[in-house]
Amino acid sequence: LVPHLGDREKRDSVCPQGKYIHPQNNSICCTKCHKGTYLYNDCPGPGQDTDCRECESGSFTASENHLRHCLSCSKCRKEMGQVEISSCTVDRDTVCGCRKNQYRHYWSENLFQCFNCSLCLNGTVHLSCQEKQNTVCTCHAGFFLRENECVSCSNCKKSLECTKLCLPQIENVKGTEDSGTT
């Protein structure tokens, strides 16, 4: 089966790599613009130069292209705790990330929020905090994991999932009490 190609891909595939079909004359292949530039005017004829101009401040193109406009630079979302790792250049978008001892949680493909890495108090670090994943904690006996924190089993209510984890501890306490009454 031949994969379905969009009009732009169809036009580009007629020309060799690094070139694109002239939109008004499909017998002409124009050279694409380098990254950091955009298409100002198509090449006037075969073997003639494409008129490419450098992206203005606040915009970029990260690969060779025949875009009529550069892409706007992304802004890091301060309200989500994001910080700028590297600023936008004509050939690279802004890179946003999190501070030290924080990780990214992606709410969607293009939206992340920075959260503090868990310290695993009353537990041990099973897996260290990574760029896109919080620390994985293992809780000490008498504690259970809730929202990635080790919480005392004394806070475990019967209706909660923690009953399975805390039950041996509760039985242990009862057993100790019983043995002390003889």
Partner: nanobody
Amino acid sequence: EVQLLESGGGLVQPGGSLRLSCAASGFTFENKTMVWVRQAPGKGLEWVSHIDATGTITYYADSVKGRFTISRDNSKNTLYLQMNSLRAEDTAVYYCALLPKRGPWFDYRGQGTLVTVSS
């Protein structure tokens, strides 16, 4: 005690409009980034939109961009979501929430309001 109460949901035809409201109390509303999330039947929570404390910074999921508008009135402690050009896939329970701070879960969110888009 933090309280968030959504209203404005209902049945609407495709292409129609609705305006959701969220009345907030029990915290300093004007200091908080607020979020609209939704849950379609049988699906997980989807981040729809958020607005910063001052109302100057907004975000929209690609699925609602150009159709939904988030706003707030800090004098009334109320968050809004204007929904235009509604589609069947917008059918969901819509919740307003405070931006999570401790981790990726919602400590504070409302009970939700059901939006049904159907002809």
